[in-house]
């Protein structure tokens, strides 16, 4: 039992996060999704193509990853944006680019941001631009939690398997 | 104890970085390579210096990491680029900077991009510039697969152990 | 069973993050820290709030993560910087932004840079700016090693749990 034979402080720590027992301790949930390049003005995640995969219980639901079992996961995502120069006749307006990984759990009535990256781009005359954003971190997640992404600047995404992706793996 | 009952070379490796003992001698292949700072116009990966290492079967061949056993790996890389302002007499031309991790496998007759990041830089008068790119993700790899990198903008790399690196570890 | 024989409050805490049980109680040290948003001109790491945590031996000392046991760890950090346009009356001076994860070890009498990212920003008239930096890699660390960060541009940090963080986990 957690906390048995431990010093009081160690026992207290052990009790804070009960652990779940997995048969054979061999399952290693992992997922890597890529943005569907056939959907140009949306970001739809796919796991059944190229180098994408769902392993050991990860599943997709409404463009979200479903957490297969409670525990700590490393969650990551990348996007690459590109754009052309603005035309001399048009006004150059700043572009707000952002990418966020969010957690939806019915504990909260809203999506909780887990990972956020942001950039302001000021397109110039005759100046095409490119910008990459990546982030990843470890989070304590619960079975059934939903991981999704929100992106500002979707029309500017460079959709390819190596540039736009979203994944997670159990630690 | 680290190094006990090992061959001399294995014992030497074991002593370099004491490691956690895992029941059943579970192997955890991992590698972290750094860009050789003595090679200014190329990107040569090194594992025998500073904080770089090859563990549990990873090896380096033709500047590529060789995957030691089939499974899921987290693969990552970072580069940092820098440049000076262009001189007033010179024309400022845009610089395309890119860094890619590629897979070469017996399954494919070409290098498959796994991770790509890109940036356009427009050097200005009296304006030195700096740019960092990082990416990483989980991939299903096969024993013998080769992981390599391709970089556009190599002369602009800031080659130090903490700025330019490439690594992978088994999940 | 987790939560059995605990006080109600302890049992409630125990239920907060059910985790996978690993055979032989194999410990999986992990930590995720977030920048304290109440400290605007410094970067203080916190583990007792939002989605931050310290697990299986990680602890925080003098704003550094203490490595609980020798082994290979994946270490990561992110910062997001923002700024307003400079006023027409003021001179626009370039801003050097940098973020570094450092190692302080009894082996070395100084802080060793592990991960470094850098950026030069040139604020323009009426042009607010945003910039994100992320990095992470695998390192061989020794019990008692201290992992800390150094940041240039702290007044410009966008301090929120999803934008500024620092973490590590044992492989």
């Amino acid at each position: 039992l957690p906390g048995v034979g431990l010093t009081p402080s160690a026992a207290q720590t052990a009790r804070q996060h009960p652990k779940m027992h997995l048969a054979h301790s061999t399952l290693k949930p992992a997922a890597h999704l890529i943005g569907d390049p056939s959907k140009q003005n949306s970001l739809l995640w796919r796991a059944n193509t190229d180098r994408a995969f769902l392993q050991d219980g990860f599943s997709l639901s409404n463009n979200s990853l479903l957490v297969p079992t409670s525990g700590i996961y490393f969650v990551y995502s990348q996007v690459v944006f590109s754009g052309k120069a603005y035309s001399p006749k048009a006004t150059s307006s700043p572009l707000y680019l952002a990418h966020e990984v969010q957690l939806f759990s019915s504990q909260y009535p809203f999506h909780v941001p887990l990972l956020s990256s942001q950039k302001m781009v000021y397109p110039g005359l005759q100046e095409p631009w490119l910008h990459s954003m990546y982030h990843g971190a470890a989070f304590q997640l619960t079975q059934g939690d939903q991981l999704s992404t929100h992106t500002d600047g979707i029309p500017h995404l460079v959709l390819s398997p190596s540039t736009v992706f979203f994944g997670a793996f159990a630690l | 104890l680290p190094g006990v009952g090992l061959t001399p070379s294995a014992a030497q490796t074991a002593r370099q970085h004491p490691k956690m003992h895992l029941a059943h001698s579970t192997l955890k292949p991992a590698a972290h390579l750094i860009g050789d700072p003595s090679k200014q116009n190329s990107l040569l990966w090194r594992a025998n210096t500073d904080r770089a290492f090859l563990q549990d079967g990873f090896s380096l061949s033709n500047n590529s990491l060789l995957v030691p056993t089939s499974g899921i790996y987290f693969v990552y890389s970072q580069v940092v680029f820098s440049g000076k302002a262009y001189s007033p007499k010179a024309t400022s031309s845009p610089l395309y900077l890119a860094h890619e991790v590629q897979l070469f496998s017996s399954q494919y007759p070409f290098h498959v991009p796994l991770l790509s990041s890109q940036k356009m830089v427009y050097p200005g008068l009296q304006e030195p510039w700096l740019h960092s790119m990082y990416h990483g993700a989980a991939f299903q790899l096969t024993q013998g697969d080769q992981l390599s990198t391709h970089t556009d903008g190599i002369p602009h790399l800031v080659l130090s152990p903490s700025t330019v690196f490439f690594g992978a570890f088994a999940l | 069973l987790p939560g059995v024989g605990l006080t109600p409050s302890a049992a409630q805490t125990a239920r907060q993050h059910p985790k996978m049980h690993l055979a032989h109680s194999t410990l999986k040290p992990a930590a995720h820290l977030i920048g304290d948003p109440s400290k605007q001109n410094s970067l203080l790491w916190r583990a007792n709030t939002d989605r931050a945590f310290l697990q299986d031996g990680f602890s925080l000392s003098n704003n550094s993560l203490l490595v609980p046991t020798s082994g290979i760890y994946f270490v990561y950090s992110q910062v997001v910087f923002s700024g307003k346009a400079y006023s027409p009356k003021a001179t626009s001076s370039p801003l050097y932004l940098a973020h570094e994860v450092q190692l302080f070890s009894s082996q070395y009498p100084f802080h060793v840079p592990l991960l470094s990212s850098q950026k030069m920003v040139y604020p323009g008239l009426q042009e607010p700016w945003l910039h994100s930096m992320y990095h992470g890699a695998a390192f061989q660390l020794t019990q008692g090693d201290q992992l800390s960060t150094h940041t240039d541009g702290i007044p410009h940090l966008v301090l929120s749990p999803s934008t500024v963080f620092f973490g590590a986990f044992a492989l």
Epitope: A47, F53, Q55, T142, Q143 | - | P2, P18
Partner: antibody, heavy 118, light 107 residues
């Protein structure tokens, strides 16, 4: 030993409501979701949705959203399926199931029969 | 929703026979397929997950294979207790869906 016991089934008129219960034992109730799966007489299996007792997180098959609600009571180690506006085609054996990994229905109750008929 | 189509819908076999049941998904589901066994009046039992991994306690005569859209459950040597209905299930995306079942009867 993991045990799931359903109750609350029976005969109900079209348009009526019914609440099914699933009493769980033999494991930490808050560590796993509870799924509901139904099987019409002589037909295949159909996933209804799940509830996570730890945080009350839910996910439904769109087909059942609005009419069916899945909930749980931690203090009683019991999950519930509230069914409203019942139709003849809802006649089925309703099972609760506990997964190992989320989408793998590893443990099942014995099932409870719901008959919708006038 | 992803449709799972099993074939055959029923088959007759003898003890010791090698039995193969196939399942086709309406779209690629990677390796995210599970197989269940159900006997009359009983709840289903998990046999295989992730296309080819046997669940704890399942006899080695049960094996699964396939990826993408086509999957197979094989019973290498049919035993008396194996006469039942078998269902495939995709666990690639919600709503998780099942095949219509394959009834294995005694010849």
């Amino acid at each position: 030993e993991v045990q799931l016991v359903e109750s609350g089934g029976g005969l109900v008129q079209p348009g009526g409501s019914l609440r099914l219960s699933c009493a769980a034992s033999g494991y930490t109730f808050t560590s796993y979701v509870i799924h509901w799966v139904r099987q019409a007489p002589g037909k295949g299996l159909e996933w209804v949705g799940y509830n996570n007792p730890y945080n009350d997180g839910t996910n439904y098959n769109e087909k059942f959203k609005g009419r069916f609600t899945i909930s749980s009571d931690k203090s009683k180690n019991t999950a519930y399926l509230q069914m409203n506006s019942l139709r003849a085609e809802d006649t089925a054996v309703y099972y609760c199931s506990r997964p190992t990994m989320l989408p793998w229905f590893a443990y099942w109750g014995q099932g409870t029969l719901v008959t919708v008929s006038s | 929703d992803i449709q799972m189509t099993q074939s055959p819908s029923s088959l007759s076999a003898s003890v010791g026979d090698r039995v193969t049941i196939t399942c086709r998904a309406s779209q690629a589901v990677s390796s995210a397929v599970a197989w269940y066994q159900q006997k009359p009046g009983k709840a289903p039992k998990l046999l295989i997950y992730s296309a080819s991994h046997r669940y704890t306690g399942v006899p080695s005569r049960f094996s699964g294979s396939g990826s993408g859209t086509d999957f197979t459950l094989t019973i290498s040597s049919l035993q008396p207790e194996d006469f039942a209905t078998y269902y495939c299930q995709q666990h690639y995306s919600t709503p998780w869906t099942f095949g219509q079942g394959t009834k294995v009867e005694i010849k």
